[in-house]
């Protein structure tokens, strides 16, 4: 069981721990330079009790 | 504002059933799970069981399995848990709760006295 | 089942100390996979539900004041309130949702 892909975010990069986002994998966003990154810049894949896997939170945003 | 609002209170006599309904507004409701707490008066908190509004599989303390049934209305985002077989000790302060590793938002809770 | 077994049952503490509450489980709550601890604190003041103050055992929910504070992994956990004041006065209870979700039986904190 895995999680879905979160996405990219506008004008960001992001490192992926892993191609498939098993549980325990890994996305961090890094904001284009000049943008300021507003939520969580790090998501981790975790299971639920009752519900597939989800990340821990939503995809942030790079604002100006 | 995210809100669960949940039914009146209930009086049952010992033996009946009670079904008790949680609405959800302020969040998309099959984004999280719903679960259900119980406090008895002056007791601690425990944890009854929950369910996935996206898919509709549940989870339950086997203290209660058999006994309770958690349903869902992904139209009216509205939770249901329903307790039979009902004895004086389920008398307590029955809670919905938002939550798939923690519970952020908590209904104002639903007292249900069981007395013949 | 995990269980969750928290320490005191019961604390007063003057106005503007530390408090401290501690809290075990009977197995650890460190997921290798996904390096948290599936561990919770919730603060209940009377005739309210439970509000929840920590996840992750050490991170703060939005809006909780910064005098509280969570600390410990796999088996052994605490809750710090550094500063003490009036409305702090409540039942802490520790959970966990490692498997499932259990509770520990609460921690009544009262004004010395």
């Known amino acids: 069981t895995s999680c879905h892909d979160p996405g990219d975010v506008e004008h960001s990069r992001r490192l992926i721990s892993s191609p498939k986002f098993p549980v325990g994998a890994t996305v961090q966003y890094i904001c284009d330079q000049g943008f300021v990154l507003m939520g969580s810049s790090i998501l981790t894949c975790h299971d639920r009790q009752a519900g597939s896997p989800k990340w821990s939170d939503r995809a942030p945003k790079c604002l100006l | 504002q995210v809100q669960l609002v949940q039914s009146g209170a209930e009086v049952k006599k010992p033996g009946a059933s009670v079904k008790v309904s949680c609405k959800a507004s302020?969040?998309?409701?099959?984004?999280?799970?719903m679960h259900w707490v119980r406090q008895a008066p002056g007791q601690g908190l425990e944890w009854m069981g929950g369910?996935?509004?996206?898919?509709?599989?549940?989870v339950y303390n086997q203290k209660f399995k058999g006994r309770v049934t958690l349903t869902e209305d992904t139209s009216t985002s509205t939770a249901y848990m329903e307790l039979r077989s009902l004895r004086s000790e389920d008398t307590a302060v029955y809670y919905c709760?938002?939550?798939?590793?923690?519970?952020?938002?908590w209904g104002q809770g639903t007292t249900v006295t069981v007395s013949s | 089942d995990i269980v969750m077994t928290q320490s005191p049952d019961s604390l007063a503490v003057s106005l503007g100390e530390r408090a401290t509450i501690n809290c075990k489980s009977s197995?650890?709550?460190?997921?290798?996979?996904?390096?948290?601890?599936?561990l919770a604190w919730y603060q209940q003041k009377p005739g309210q539900p439970p509000k929840l103050l920590i996840y992750?055992?050490?991170t703060r929910e939005s809006g909780v004041p910064d005098r509280f504070s969570g600390s410990g992994s796999g088996t052994d956990f605490t809750l710090t309130i550094s500063s003490l004041q009036a409305e702090d006065v409540a039942v802490y209870y520790c959970?966990?949702?490692?498997?499932?979700?259990?509770f520990g039986q609460g921690t009544k904190l009262e004004i010395k």
């Open positions: 302020g969040y998309t409701f099959t984004d999280y799970e």
């Open positions: 959970g966990q949702s490692y498997n499932l979700f259990t």
């Open positions: 369910i996935d509004p996206e898919s509709d599989n549940t």
């Open positions: 197995q650890s709550l460190l997921n290798s996979r996904t390096r948290e601890n599936y």
């Open positions: 992750w055992a050490s």
């Open positions: 709760t938002r939550g798939d590793w923690y519970f952020d938002v």
